[in-house]
Amino acid sequence: DTHKSEVAHRFKDLGEEHFKGLVLVAFSQYLQQCPFEEHVKLVNEVTEFAKTCVADESAENCDKSLHTLFGDKLCTVATLRETYGEMADCCAKQEPERNECFLQHKDDNPNLPPLVRPEVDVMCTAFHDNEATFLKKYLYEVARRHPYFYAPELLFFAARYKAAFAECCQAADKAACLLPKLDELRDEGKASSAKQRLKCASLQKFGDRAFKAWAVARLSQKFPKAEFAEVSKLVTDLTKVHTECCHGDLLECADDRADLAKYMCENQDSISSKLKECCDKPLLEKSHCLAEVENDEMPADLPSLAADYVESKDVCKNYAEAKDVFLGMFLYEYARRHPDYSVMLLLRLAKAYEATLEKCCAAADPHECYAKVFDEFQPLVEEPQNLVKQNCELFEQLGEYKFQNALLVRYTKKVPQVSTPTLVEVSRNLGKVGAKCCKLPEAKRMPCAEDYLSVVLNRLCVLHEKTPVSEKVTKCCTESLVNRRPCFSALELDEAYVPKAFNAETFTFHADMCTLSEKEKQVKKQTALVELVKHKPKATKEQLKGVMDNFAAFVEKCCKADDKEACFAEEGPKFVAASQAALA
């Protein structure tokens, strides 16, 4: 349905608070370097304009598209050229090219200082002094660091952030109340950002067919009692929501997400028995709850798929008549029966089934040709099962830190050209799969592990795309979305890599090591480990373990010394010399 004024329509649908929050997020995700005050000024101007359009939809400029209105506003920023360089050239373009241009300049790794958490009393004072500004600052800081963060979900995080301060700033022990909540929000926020980044990459790099396939598989696992037509409707709506958010259309995205939540709650009976507790909640919480809802129980008596997808003489006829619908139904039927499989595995199985039909439906005896298609799935299923088993055993044996180190070594040997900070970040996150998934029952391990790894590897792909250095990474990232993880798993030591020259500066440490948090110390040590492997890619596990044990001992010794800096200056070169000898 068309509206005379799109901006008035969205303002009325969303309400002023959500409208302002979403516009702030949109602007912060586009202009990531702009100061907070500049963005607040722009948002206030847009909001005032929207109100004039609500009062009179025929007022001047109220008929313009949101892209035109927002783009015009962004292009009024005086320092655009000096702050953003060639991004300023976007402003010379017309819509829709201008918005596409802004999207292309979103930076997944902006050069912004890490967020430092002030003292609890300082934060509580700021919260009480000006709650609205405090919460806007949160939206701004998160959005500029995570330019693809799912905007309506960020509003939910902001609501939880507000609730945490409202509760804890009145508590007897403010810090004990607040800090765990902030840690939880930070960790959940990073995870949410990474998951959404994969959705956007899926849509932008592989198209909406890839995203729809992912959604069919995931929603069929969640809602195994729902009919295929119902799942298809949800997939269509969900694809629209995420296409809008990934495309920077945050007001439309939030509005459509609210409509989807409304539809799901009005049609619970034909979707899932698990939606009930979500549907009593307020909007932001409701949408979040629906997105995270647990899998419904499988219908009591599902038949084997063999009858319709192997034994039937009509397989090729049905496939030819509507390929995507037939494959979609196959994926739905398989996924609803297999909540124990990762979505990526289900998509590989559907791909294998499609490839078999493409080959066999052109053969002399199609039925004979595809009769064993399900048996061909076995190696595809066993590969992630074995991978999860082996890595969980390794995690249980080593613990998280050493498991991360094993992955650091493994991935540095595979792709040594990748920058050290990226290898450290990605390997540390890959290593978190252990604590996240290995404690789960067998039936939940694979979906947890492989779908989490897909999210982490997408981060590697996104960072690598910005600064490509490895053909292997490019190949794994671009050839097939569903085979990314198996592609990286299959990479071996890069024999063509010329080892990095030894640089003593890289292994020079100072007394500031001693004041670092445990996490920061780990990152320092892991950075050194990556540099060691880049210097000696063929070093054995035992050699590397020896050097790392010596490193830990050297740091511990100097941090206990009276004159720490003198100790580092004296013991450091000895450690470097001993390490070089050990790796020779």
Epitope: M298, A300, D301, L302, P303, S304, L305, A306, V310, E333, Y334, R337, H338, P339, D340, Y341, F374, D375, F377, Q378, V381, E382, A443
Partner: nanobody, 123 residues
Framework: EVQLVESGGGLVQAGGSLRLSCAAS????????MGWFRQAPGKERERVVS????????YYADSVKGRFTISRDNAENTVYLQMNSLKPEDTAVYYC????????????????WGQGTLVTVSS
């Protein structure tokens, strides 16, 4: 601990009948699809027949259709395989298996396996 115990195997003349039983313990029987697989000497294990959790759906390999019948009794935690018109090529060790999640009835979808019972069909 999950246990599947097969019984009812033995030596039978071609054209004769046997009824195999598989008693399950240590699992929620009604939550598992059940299947019978067989392995003849020197050959790979093959699926013979499987039955859905509630018993409403069955899958039969072409080689046994019309001769074998699978059934289950969820109250007794037991699955049965009635084998009629037996042939020498039916000679094999018959394994009972349970699948928490199943789409295809293929071997890799089955989580628990019995030790097997030998069926010998003489000509």
């Amino acid at each position: 601990e999950v246990q599947l115990v097969e019984s009812g195997g033995g030596l039978v003349q071609a054209g004769g009948s046997l009824r195999l039983s598989c008693a399950a313990s240590g699992l929620t029987f009604s939550s598992y699809a059940m299947g019978w697989f067989r392995q003849a000497p020197g050959k790979e294990r093959e699926r013979v027949v499987s039955i859905s959790r509630g018993g409403g759906y069955t899958y039969y390999a072409d080689s046994v259709k019309g001769r074998f019948t699978i059934s289950r009794d969820n109250a007794e935690n037991t699955v049965y395989l009635q084998m009629n018109s037996l042939k020498p090529e039916d000679t094999a060790v018959y394994y009972c298996a349970a699948a928490r999640y199943w789409a295809t009835g293929s071997e890799y979808e089955f989580d628990y396996w019995g030790q097997g019972t030998l069926v010998t069909v003489s000509s």
